[in-house]
Interface confidence: low
């Protein structure tokens, strides 16, 4: 069965479903689970043998406004030794998360949602050999 | 709320926060981009703390289909191939905004929602705890 | 609290036997690796001997073929059989469990160790 998109009409439209102008829909940013925890361990963009630092991004005109995105710490991973191994790869991991951006054109203004790439963390990934021919 | 700059030119009646309900464009800015992380790397099988992925669906939520990470095991691959007890395989959670579909089967309307994702896996040191 | 709490441990002529249990409180619920280690008096802290939460284990090439390490998984208990002891086996010994542990409603990885008992081997 055809998972319904964004839109896409393949819902029973209840009767009570409110009236939206053609090529929009309703959108309410009163945000269901606003409070929910992350319960991640303790330091774990420290302890990781692929450390990151975290950066935050702010933009008056997204919502939400602070985005945080991490980088991660070095080319390599870190040893047992503590020092930096590269023979392995520190690699970013991603997520897509939307964001609702507003636009102003001139003194009207118009809502997008958009769809925004985060880099979650960093992951220790054995590196692809390539073999010259 | 959040404040925003605005054309000091426009009339006074235009609110400075997001209001609680917006009219969306349809049309998704960056909405083809990947969203099956196996195919966008294959990390999850190179990390020394791989991962499985599962497809997590909901018609009523958007987008779709999320995908989840679970840690294939309690400690972290070594060199040699083996897992390595001494350290550990941990979930990296990401909170992020989807749509859900409010009142419920209605095609255009939503509420945002925020969910906690695994996305992969890291492998961390432990913290060490002597009695004293 | 995650707490370690050794026992076992005494004074007993070489060639007898002993049996120390390490039991981890309630608090660690996956519990990656156990393992005794021992320390000798002016010595560095020796791994004994180790299980893994898949039941592999390892043992230092000194106590092979007269220790063994065993465990009870509804306990949270790890046992060391020490057989055939010697008097080079004198020292003091600890258990070290490394697990995911709940405290105040986050899980952590950590590296636990108990207080130490005490092994004499003299006749």
């Known amino acids: 069965r055809k998972i319904p998109k964004v839109g896409h009409t393949f819902f029973q439209k209840p009767e009570s479903c409110p009236p939206v102008p053609g090529g929009s829909m309703k959108l309410d940013i009163g945000i269901i689970n606003e409070n929910q925890r992350v319960s991640m361990s303790r330091n774990i963009e420290s302890r990781s043998t692929s450390p990151w630092n975290y950066t935050v991004t702010w933009d008056p005109n997204r919502y939400p406004s602070e985005v945080v995105q991490a980088q991660c710490r070095n080319l390599g991973c870190i040893n047992a030794q503590g020092k930096e191994d590269i023979s392995m790869n520190s690699v970013p991991i991603q997520q897509e998360t939307l964001v609702v951006r507003r636009k102003h054109q001139g003194c009207s203004v118009s809502f997008q949602l958009e769809k925004v790439l985060v880099t979650v963390g960093c992951t220790c990934v054995t590196p692809v050999i390539h073999h010259v021919q | 709320g959040i404040t925003i700059p605005r054309n000091p030119g426009c009339p006074n009646s235009e609110d400075k926060n997001f209001p609680r309900t917006v009219m969306v464009n349809l049309n998704i800015h960056n909405r083809n981009t990947n969203t099956n992380p196996k195919r966008s790397s294959d990390y999850y099988n190179r990390s020394t703390s791989p991962w499985n992925l599962h497809r997590n669906e909901d018609p009523e939520r958007y987008p779709s289909v999320i995908w989840e990470a679970k840690c294939r095991h309690l400690g972290c691959i070594n060199a040699d191939g083996n897992v390595d007890y001494h350290m550990n395989s941990v979930p990296i959670q990401q909170e992020i905004l989807v749509l859900r579909r409010e009142p419920p089967h209605c095609p255009n309307s939503f509420r945002l929602e925020k969910i906690l994702v695994s996305v992969g896996c890291t492998c961390v040191t432990p913290i060490v705890h002597h009695v004293a | 609290e995650v707490q370690l709490v050794e026992s076992g441990g005494g004074l007993v002529q070489p060639g007898g036997s002993l049996r120390l249990s390490c039991a981890a409180s309630r608090n660690i619920n996956i519990i990656n690796y156990m393992a005794w280690y021992r320390q000798a008096p002016g010595n560095q802290r020796e791994l004994v001997a180790a299980m893994t939460s898949d039941a592999t284990t390892e043992y230092a090439d000194s106590v092979k073929g007269r220790f063994t390490i065993s465990r009870d998984i509804p306990e949270n208990t790890v046992y060391l059989q020490m057989n055939s002891l010697k008097p080079e086996d004198t020292a003091v010994y600890y258990c070290?469990?490394?697990?995911?542990?709940?405290?105040?409603?986050?899980?952590?990885?950590?590296?636990?160790w108990g207080q130490g008992t005490q092994v004499t081997v003299s006749s």
């Open positions: 070290n469990a490394k697990g995911i542990w709940d405290y105040l409603g986050r899980r952590d990885f950590g590296d636990y």
